[in-house]
């Protein structure tokens, strides 16, 4: 029978550093190795009948044991898959490798209205493009942590919101006269050091009535 | 035939640092990484890290991470570990293999004594 | 992290005997277990991996079998010289020894 596997199905690397992806195989007299990656819509093949293709070959070398990078950047998190069939045979087999590619958060952007009406909705955002893995966010009003759900901490329980530590988006519905303050939010990705985005203050205003 | 060959007994103080290399031949260096395994007395084996002596790349066990550096000299075929801030608890018998999935091929191991 | 329980801790059998050594993973690990003999003074020595696959040169009385968590490795007849200590070891997700079953003679 035949085996295709890796001891590390998942690999975690900073930015700029040599890693190597193991592909390790048994059962084939004459093995074909290739590699494909794997990121969204994007598919590539890195390695074909074992050997790098072009577009890769400045900076990847094939190993009986797997793929070397000599550098990785951003670019490269995704999957890869490592598959091996007989030359001219029909024995096969496959093992996916993820590789994370550690950059740590930059600074946030946020996106908070300076004035908001009472009783309608209010949604703040905050994001950041470079953390690998994808940031997760905090949010902060008046320098105290936001909890996730407004009716866990009695500061906040007036407040009616909804926030996303994923998308970073903090929606108030509706806005209360107790919602005022100054807010801001941190980027982390458990990799390098949090980021702080500027502290912006956001008035709840009465809604203005005609007469 | 493959053979992996590690330096001598060492006995160091607390505090210090030890530095053991590992030299192999039979095979090709580069096309394996390479393991550095703990045996302290009375105890189990541990992964320590490894090395993939292609392109210098590492990878440390988290119990181990910050003291210990994993290198590779590809002219001499040579895996080094160095280990610092040692204390009492770092005697044991270090091994350093070679990975193709599992670990194949082991040197002799290196006695390493921490004691004041 | 996969933990590996091993037992028993130790045993003591007779020449001839079938002796028999178990590993129990934390969650399955798809038959990638491998088998050492380490004997005193010495470095560990592969006997199976991928669960049944005796390396090269390695007695056919070492046996291995199991799948998912559960892994077993036999000495159908004890021999003098199979007096040492005996280690599983997981490599399915990283690497994990069990703690070992030392060998002795009745």
């Known amino acids: 029978s035949v085996t295709v596997h890796s001891s590390e199905p998942e690999v975690r690397i900073p930015e700029n550093n040599p890693v190597k992806l193991s592909c390790a195989y048994s059962g084939f007299s004459s093995p074909r190795v290739e590699w494909k990656f794997d990121q969204g819509d994007t598919t590539r093949l890195v390695c074909y009948n074992n050997k790098i293709t072009a577009s890769y070959e400045d900076r990847v070398t094939f190993l009986p044991t797997g793929i070397t990078f000599k550098s990785v950047t951003r670019e490269d998190t995704g999957t890869y898959t490592c598959m091996v069939s007989e030359e001219g045979g029909n024995s096969y087999g496959e093992v996916k490798v993820k590789l994370i590619v550690l950059v740590p958060p930059s600074k946030p952007t946020v996106n908070i209205p300076s004035s908001a009406t009472i009783g309608n909705r209010a949604v703040l955002t905050c994001s950041e493009q470079d953390g690998s893995p994808p940031s997760e966010y905090t949010w902060f009003k008046d320098g105290i942590v936001m909890p996730t759900n407004p009716k866990s901490t009695r500061a906040f329980s007036n407040s009616s919101y909804v926030l996303n530590p994923t998308t970073g988006e903090l929606v108030f519905d509706p806005l209360s006269a107790s919602d005022t303050g100054e807010y801001s939010c941190e980027a982390r990705n458990g990799y390098g050091t949090p980021m702080t985005s500027n502290a912006v203050r956001m008035e709840a205003v009465e809604r203005n009535v005609g007469v | 035939e493959i053979q992996l060959v590690q330096s001598g007994a060492e006995v160091k103080k607390p505090g210090a640092t030890v530095k053991i290399s590992c030299k192999v031949s039979g095979y090709s260096f580069t096309d394996y990484s390479m393991y550095w395994v703990q045996q302290a007395p009375g105890k189990g084996l541990e992964w320590i890290g490894y090395?993939?002596?292609?392109?210098?790349?590492?990878r440390y066990n988290q119990k181990f991470k910050g003291r210990v550096t994993i290198t590779a000299d590809k002219s001499t075929d040579t895996a080094y570990m160095e280990l610092s801030s040692l204390r009492s608890e770092d005697t044991a018998v270090y091994y350093c293999?070679?990975?193709?999935?599992?670990?194949?091929?082991w040197g002799q191991g290196t006695l390493v004594t921490v004691s004041s | 992290d996969i933990q590996m329980t091993q037992s028993p801790s130790s045993l003591s059998a007779s020449v001839g005997d079938r002796v028999t050594i178990t590993c129990k993973a934390s969650q399955d690990i798809n038959n990638y277990i491998a088998w050492y003999q380490q004997k005193p003074g010495k470095a560990p020595k592969l006997l199976i991996h991928?669960?049944?696959t005796l390396q090269a040169g390695v007695p056919s009385r070492f046996s291995g079998s199991g799948s998912g968590r559960d892994y077993t490795f036999t000495i159908s007849s004890l021999q003098p010289e199979d007096i040492a200590t005996y280690y599983c070891l997981q490599y399915d997700n990283l690497w994990t020894f069990g703690q070992g079953t030392k060998v002795e003679i009745k």
């Open positions: 991928y669960t049944s």
């Open positions: 090395i993939d002596p292609y392109n210098g790349g590492t």
């Open positions: 293999a070679r990975q193709t999935d599992y670990f194949d091929y």
